[in-house]
């Protein structure tokens, strides 16, 4: 058993039918010695008396808010949560496996640049009685500071019969140098509590591996005289690291017809312009990627050909 | 995706082309190592990230873009003295900081070159003959060093008398390639920045 926060404790259970569970001793936080009784949750049934209460915690029915009273007055509370270990593996019931970029990916994180700011998000089908708390650091043995905000509900989607909820959090490394070569990964730890179930999820990454630039901005077309060709130009996104000559991007320009089946013409360039043939009803899209370290491509920025 | 090949203009900063070739070569070699050594811990998540140049060179600091020198987190200054007569510098652009930066890059390349050659000698003794260093990568390191043209003491190749542990050697190769790829990215960024200056 360990303390998650004041008066909230996590009991780790080897989870299988007929398991013996864990013996837990609760102590009433009071100078009083006599006339103390214990109850669980809203029930008025007295579970025991005395300054300490010994319970055998086996299942969720044994978890909850234990309260010690004296003469109708509440003295203190202890909330017991359960953390299930199923055949050597901690349970992952609360969050959905996003399966991207690989199986057992519960937390996904992205950074728009090398400033040390990043966003993580996760999915769940649970709508109520759910709380998250996020901590992060650079490295684990001698951790350096990363500050995270509060997790917030950022999107709701309908997936088949189920509603899916997306939560996200923003974090910022306290002293980040955009040019630094990372040797210790960022660690992100999310504590999730649903009703009386506790779970924790972790992700470990280098900022360089989670970079996804914003789409190029100011995408413009300039028709070339007496030609079906157009000059496409764009600019680096505002959120990208500077100077751009050091943090360079490479670009992919795509000409896509109305129909998804039509052949796509693609050009790769390091410049911020390209000459392409603009077909009728087609659109031109441009996306960006770090020129030297192949992390994710940005989303497309698009303009119609007409 | 192969990195785009830059065709250098005659007046172009001479090292940019070489640094792009270096990044392409080390990226290819790392990819090959990860495929060949699939049953070894060779992915970024599995290896320990070690920098063999730590406390010996200070490339990131010495080559910091001017715009980032205002960022306190980037000024983890380490006093290191370097020889300063590089030929990548067009004489007009020669400055002490730039020379310090390029000589630091040269020292990095020299250290990695020695490590890779020592490692290749061990890998050639492996009866499995599973993986060797790409000669193209070694040649590209050499070409960039020549382009930088710094006079420096030659570091003798490390020779080992004991029987090599091939498992450990292959893991060390992965660690070295990951670290060298990161350094090659920094070198490429620096060359691109200097070229634009």
């Amino acid at each position: 058993i360990w303390e998650l926060k004041k008066d909230v404790y996590v009991v780790e259970l080897d989870w299988y039918p007929d398991a013996p569970g864990e013996m837990v001793v609760l102590t009433c936080d009071t100078p009083e010695e006599d006339g103390i009784t214990w109850t669980l949750d809203q029930s008025s049934e007295v579970l025991g008396s005395g300054k300490t209460l010994t319970i055998q915690v086996k299942e969720f029915g044994d978890a909850g808010q234990y309260t010690c009273h004296k003469g109708g007055e509440v003295l203190s509370h202890s909330l017991l949560l359960l953390h299930k270990k199923e055949d050597g593996i901690w349970s992952t019931d609360i969050l959905k496996d996003q399966k991207e970029p690989k199986n057992k990916t519960f937390l996904r994180c992205e950074a728009k640049n090398y400033s040390g700011r990043f966003t993580c998000w996760w999915l769940t089908t649970i709508s109520t009685d759910l709380t998250f708390s996020v901590k992060s650091s650079r490295g684990s043995s001698d951790p350096q500071g990363v500050t995270c905000g509060a997790a917030t509900l950022s999107a709701e989607r309908v997936r088949g019969d189920n509603k899916e909820y997306e939560y996200s959090v923003e974090c910022q490394e306290d002293s980040a140098c955009p040019a630094a070569e990372e040797s210790l990964p960022i660690e992100v730890m999310v504590d999730a509590v649903h009703k009386l179930k506790y779970e924790n999820y972790t992700s470990s990454f280098f900022i360089r591996d989670i970079i996804k630039p914003d789409p190029p901005k100011n995408l413009q077309l300039k028709p070339l005289k007496n030609s079906r060709q157009v000059e496409v130009s764009w600019e680096y996104p505002d959120t990208w690291s500077t100077p751009h000559s050091y943090f360079s991007l490479t670009f992919c320009v795509q000409v896509q017809g109305k129909s998804k089946r039509e052949k796509k013409d693609r050009v790769f360039t390091d410049k911020t312009s390209a000459t392409v043939i603009c077909r009728k009803n087609a659109s031109i899209s441009v996306r960006a990627q770090d020129r030297y370290y192949s992390s994710s491509w940005s989303e497309w920025a698009s303009v119609p050909c007409s | 995706r192969n990195l785009p090949v830059a065709t250098p203009d005659p007046g172009m900063f001479p090292c940019l082309h070489h640094s792009q070739n270096l990044l392409r070569a080390v990226s290819n070699m790392l990819q090959k190592a990860r495929q060949t050594l699939e049953f070894y811990p060779c992915t970024s998540e599995e290896i320990d990230h070690e920098d063999i140049t730590k406390d010996k060179t200070s490339t990131v600091e010495a080559c910091l873009p001017l715009e980032l020198t205002k960022n306190e987190s980037c000024l983890n200054s380490r006093e290191t003295s370097f020889i300063t007569n590089g030929s990548c510098l067009a004489s007009r652009k020669t400055s002490f900081m730039m020379a310090l930066c390029l000589s630091s890059i040269y020292e990095d390349l020299k250290m990695y070159q020695v490590e890779f050659k020592t490692m290749n000698a061990k890998l050639l003794m492996d009866p499995k003959r599973q993986i060797f260093l790409d000669q193209n990568m070694l040649a590209v390191i050499d070409e960039l060093m020549q382009a930088l043209n710094f006079n420096s003491e030659t570091v003798p190749q490390k020779s080992s008398l004991e029987e090599p542990d091939f498992y450990k050697t292959k893991i060390k190769l992965c660690i070295l390639l990951h670290a060298f790829r990161i350094r090659a990215v920094t070198i490429d960024r620096v060359m691109s920045y200097l070229n634009a200056s």
Epitope: P17, D18, K104 | -
Partner: antibody, heavy 115, light 111 residues
Framework: QVQLVQSGGGVVQPGRSLRLSCAAS????????MHWVRQAPGKGLEWVAF????????YYADSVKGRFTISRDNSKNTLYLQMKSLRAEDTAVYYC????????WGQGTMVTVSS | SYVLTQPPSVSGTPGQRVTISCSGG????????VKWYQQLPGTAPKLLIY???QRPSGVPDRFSGSKSGTSASLAITGVQAEDEADYYC????????????FGTGTKVTVL
Amino acid sequence: QVQLVQSGGGVVQPGRSLRLSCAASGFTFSSYGMHWVRQAPGKGLEWVAFIRYDGSNKYYADSVKGRFTISRDNSKNTLYLQMKSLRAEDTAVYYCKTHGSHDNWGQGTMVTVSS
Amino acid sequence: SYVLTQPPSVSGTPGQRVTISCSGGRSNIGSNTVKWYQQLPGTAPKLLIYGNDQRPSGVPDRFSGSKSGTSASLAITGVQAEDEADYYCQSYDRGTHPLTMFGTGTKVTVL
């Protein structure tokens, strides 16, 4: 006392269907994940499928994917394995078992696929 | 499609020490715990070892398990006639848990 009692095995022709049941007692069935495992005559153990405690996630071996469906009825404390498009190579003793570091197995039920 | 490899058979005389190996990879045994089962003819498998080296109550202490890197082993010190059975190791793959992997199985013969 944890008990898993299996039923529904038998002889069936190739291409036909069969449903196996596993009735649980002696524990809170709705709190635990469950597996199906099979063993062809004279062969080793082969994992078949798994279902989470609340039925929200199901996992299958490649050899049965698309043909077999694992399900559970927590109100009846029963686990099921619906087997369709049966093949001769599905002939085996099928076991249900609980998920956890200590597991409990059913007695097994024989499924014979033969024309 | 077995990923956990066991020797098909091992044998020993009563009182001898018999060991069975189970060889896997970094993503299964290297990342997860191992179980061992004993299966007597015509019966369901019985759990002998869980968590690599833990014995459930009721399992004789002559059975012991261990794990090192990507391999695990089961030892029977002082093998007895009633130990003649099939033995299976079991683990998970870190990316596909709870998809379960069983070893190929080992027949233990007491001479």
